[in-house]
């Protein structure tokens, strides 16, 4: 059993998060998961899920009585998630720390919106996909 | 040229992100996303990036003298990002609007934790290939 | 070409009011959408308020409601944002924008700053 599972338990009672009720009016993200096969879709939205997640955390990271568990939880989806690569995780953590505020960070992004859309498409990579796609366009 | 070409341009005009100097000490986006060269990886960095710049826009939506620009921008990153896939951008921006301090969602979210975790490595989605996996380690 | 020239600015107790005017060259401000942005010291672009070209929309930010007023002088060309109420949060270089022709401007501001 991987360890994080005894730790979440640990969670449920802390969050008094166990209890059937928990789950009336839907899922937060299980359902979400359940639409997206492949595996593209599946990390844009697990992206989303495992920020939420460390913010969620981030909350609580003076919280003694729990600490233990949501390390190791984290250091769980560090493997699973970025695949125990460091600076994945890094690079993530950057990005999901940005302020929409701050001067410096507003003009950067407006600064290099045009070539954050221009990589947005996966055909947008190398010019050589793209051609082959053209030619598949008939 | 794409239509959100222009219209980022007049952003840059709007958040005076026009000048060379707004480069300096480094890029958010652009770096990042030179490090990752696999899609999947890909799509977990461009899913925070892609997150940043709706937040963003989300402060100027009734900015009239920018509605437009943040308009077609947004569709276009609907059509590059989400494929023009309009459950995709739902189920993104459910996930995106969920607050980490509301505490039936902490409860929902622990309560799926174990499954979510469960989820998070591309191995796990079905048994078959797990096990396939493993008979590549010996 | 469009011109976009702020002014009004200054320092303002707490309580106070002031109003900001913007003079507009090369379009006619009746026919646009124009609105007021702000940008406190050491932070990013905030938008403060709008108002469509037929004047019946009108918008503000919740930080200014109830406070700003953005209104438009057409025979003299002017969009005006009255400020009451300030506070020094409300400490900031205000600029107007508009749209003209598919093209965004934007003034070179005037400081207004809250300060007892």
């Known amino acids: 059993q991987d360890p994080y599972v005894k730790e979440a338990e640990n969670l449920k009672k802390y969050f008094n998060a166990g209890h059937s009720d928990v789950a009336d009016n839907g899922t937060l993200f299980l359902g979400i998961l359940k639409n997206w096969k492949e595996e593209s879709d599946r990390k844009i939205m697990q992206s989303q899920i495992v920020s939420f997640y460390f913010k969620l955390f981030k909350n609580f990271k003076d919280d003694q009585s729990i600490q233990k568990s949501v390390e190791t939880i984290k250091e769980d989806m560090n493997v699973k998630f970025f695949n125990s690569n460091k600076k994945k995780r890094d690079d993530f953590e950057k990005l999901t720390n940005y302020s929409v505020t701050d001067l410096n960070v507003q003009r950067k992004a407006i600064h290099e919106l045009i070539q954050v859309m221009a990589e947005l498409s996966p055909a947008a990579k190398t010019g050589k996909r793209k051609r082959s796609q053209m030619l598949f366009r008939g | 040229q794409d239509p959100y070409v222009k219209e980022a341009e007049n952003l840059k005009k709007y958040f005076n992100a026009g000048h060379s100097d707004v480069a300096d000490n480094g890029t958010l986006f652009l770096g990042i996303l030179k490090n990752w060269k696999e899609e999947s990886d890909r799509k977990i960095m461009q899913s925070q990036i892609v997150s940043f710049y709706f937040k963003l826009f989300k402060n100027f939506k009734d900015d009239q003298s920018i509605q437009k620009s943040v308009e077609t921008i947004k569709e276009d990153m609907n059509v590059k990002f989400f494929n023009s896939n309009k459950k995709k951008r739902d189920d993104f921006e459910k996930l995106t609007n969920y607050s980490v301090t509301d505490l039936n969602v902490q409860r929902k979210a622990i309560h799926e934790l174990i499954q979510v975790m469960a989820e998070l490595s591309p191995a796990a989605k079905t048994g078959k290939r797990k096990r396939s996996q493993m008979l590549f380690r010996g | 070409q469009v011109q976009l020239q702020e002014s009004g600015g200054g320092l303002v107790q707490p309580g106070g009011s002031l109003r900001l005017s913007c003079a507009a060259s090369?379009?006619?401000?009746?026919?646009?959408?124009m609105s007021w942005v702000r940008q406190p010291p050491g932070k990013g672009i905030e938008w403060v308020s709008s108002i469509n070209n037929r004047n019946d929309h009108i918008t503000y930010a919740d930080s200014v409601k109830g406070r700003f007023t953005i209104a438009r002088d057409n025979a003299n060309n002017i969009l005006y944002l009255q400020m009451n109420s300030l506070k020094p949060e409300d400490t900031a270089v205000y600029y107007c924008?508009?749209?003209?022709?598919?093209?965004?401007?934007r003034g070179q501001g005037t400081q207004v700053t809250v300060s007892s």
């Open positions: 924008a508009s749209r003209v022709d598919d093209r965004v401007s």
């Open positions: 090369g379009f006619t401000v009746s026919n646009y959408a």
